[in-house]
């Protein structure tokens, strides 16, 4: 084993190229200079190294940068990123959105790994807040990203970033998350006209208080049942039959199909039977 630590004559790597795929692991260790590897990281992805060979290359970078890789190297890691542990990534200082995109691209199509979660956390903390461009990027790769954040983390999202949010990005958000996001959405969209405003705010209404639902009921919005079913129960309960009828418009007929589910069930139980009868849906309080 001892003699294998020296690089065989004529095998010293002058550049990172395809010839290295024929090197044994110990030859890569002995014959590839770490500084050369760092300056030519962009070439590594074009070369079909085995996982074992990539382990050696990572080891060389770890030795060269024990405090964490510089961003110039991180941006070109490519598939070597998949070899990184969350502990490795916590040492990084990633500030460029291009670097983030490059690494997310490597993991594209897969579930969010602990490595990616750590990378995103480092990036967002470095920026100080979840700005619009970052949110755009993250939700493009992971539509459920926003709903993976705690209400506390969402508190740092500036209202301007809300423009980047698509309805599907909120599909898995719970009421506590919408609690925080809804006021931001109200600030972001308030200068839009009535119908456009409703289209934008609709996905966030799971965080709306009763008073806002009452206000919406006066605006002929025709809320669909799917949206109504996601409203906070405590916000729906004080609404009158007339207000719910105005809020839902032609969709009010859908209440019958949902009469056993919250918040419709609880709302029905709060209404006078005479009022429910005015809907003509056979709802029983």
């Amino acid at each position: 084993e001892v003699e294998k630590t020296a690089c065989p004559s004529g095998k010293k790597a002058r550049e990172i190229d395809e010839s290295l795929i024929f090197y044994k692991k110990w030859e890569l260790e002995a014959c590839v200079d770490a500084a050369l590897l760092a300056t030519q990281m962009d070439r590594v992805n074009a070369i079909p190294f085995t996982y074992e060979q990539l382990d050696v290359l990572k080891h060389k970078l770890d030795e060269l940068y024990p405090q964490g890789y510089p961003e110039s190297v991180i941006q070109h890691l490519g598939y070597l990123f998949l070899k990184m542990s969350p502990e490795d990534i916590r040492k990084w200082n990633v500030t460029s959105l291009e670097t983030l995109k490059a690494l997310l691209e490597v993991n594209k199509g897969h579930e969010m790994s602990p490595q990616v979660a750590t990378l995103i956390d480092r990036f967002v903390k470095g920026r100080g807040q979840l700005d619009k461009d970052t949110l755009d990027t993250l939700t493009a790769f992971y539509p459920g990203y926003l709903c993976s954040l705690s209400p506390e983390e969402l508190s740092s999202v500036p209202p301007s970033s809300i423009w980047a949010v698509r309805p599907q990005d909120l599909d898995t958000c719970d009421p506590r998350q919408l609690d925080v996001l809804y006021p931001k959405a109200r600030l972001a969209f308030q200068n839009m006209n009535g119908s456009e405003y409703f289209v934008k705010i609709q996905s966030f209404l799971g965080g709306a208080p009763t008073e806002d639902l009452k206000a919406l009921s006066q605006q002929n919005v025709s809320m669909d049942l799917a949206t109504f079913m996601k409203l906070r129960t405590d916000a729906v309960l004080p609404l009158t039959v007339a207000e719910v009828q105005k809020l839902l418009g032609p969709h009010v007929e859908g209440l019958k199909a949902e009469e056993r589910h919250r918040p419709v069930r609880d709302w029905i139980l709060r209404q006078r039977q005479d009022d429910l009868d005015t809907l003509g849906l056979g709802l029983q309080g």
Partner: nanobody, 121 residues
Framework: QLQLQESGPGLVKPSETLSLTCTVS?????????WGWIRQPPGKGLEWIGS???????YYNPSLKSRVTMSVDTSKNQFSLKLSSVTAADTAVYYC??????????????WGQGTLVTVSS
């Protein structure tokens, strides 16, 4: 148009509890989506401390959670912050903040002018 005004002692001893009150004028505190506190240590960026939402849910910065208590008194149009076991690292300008407009067509986020709290013996 809401006006927010922070009040409380400007000097607190280490290990004691910092208590601040935010008095709201120009409108009812009940029409707010949330009531919150933010601070800015000297030479550093803003740090969110916590918020109480209209729904009744309260959220605190995880790094401060064990030491923070926030409450709202709608009858006095005030909300308050208590931060226990303070150290010199808690020296900062403290701002109260609120977003009104519940049930209205427009909404606005308001901040107090800030109050400097120094932790020193």
């Amino acid at each position: 148009q809401l006006q927010l005004q922070e009040s409380g002692p400007g000097l607190v001893k280490p290990s004691e509890t910092l208590s601040l009150t935010c008095t709201v004028s120009g409108g009812s505190i009940s029409n707010s989506y949330y009531w919150g506190w933010i601070r800015q240590p000297p030479g550093k960026g803003l740090e969110w401390i916590g918020s109480i939402y209209h729904s009744g849910n309260t959220y605190y910065n995880p790094s401060l959670k064990s030491r923070v208590t926030m409450s709202v008194d709608t009858s006095k149009n005030q909300f308050s912050l208590k931060l226990s076991s303070v150290t010199a690292a808690d020296t900062a300008v403290y701002y109260c903040t609120s977003q009104d407009g519940v049930g209205a067509t427009t909404t606005e986020e308001y901040w107090g002018q800030g109050t400097l709290v120094t932790v020193s013996s």
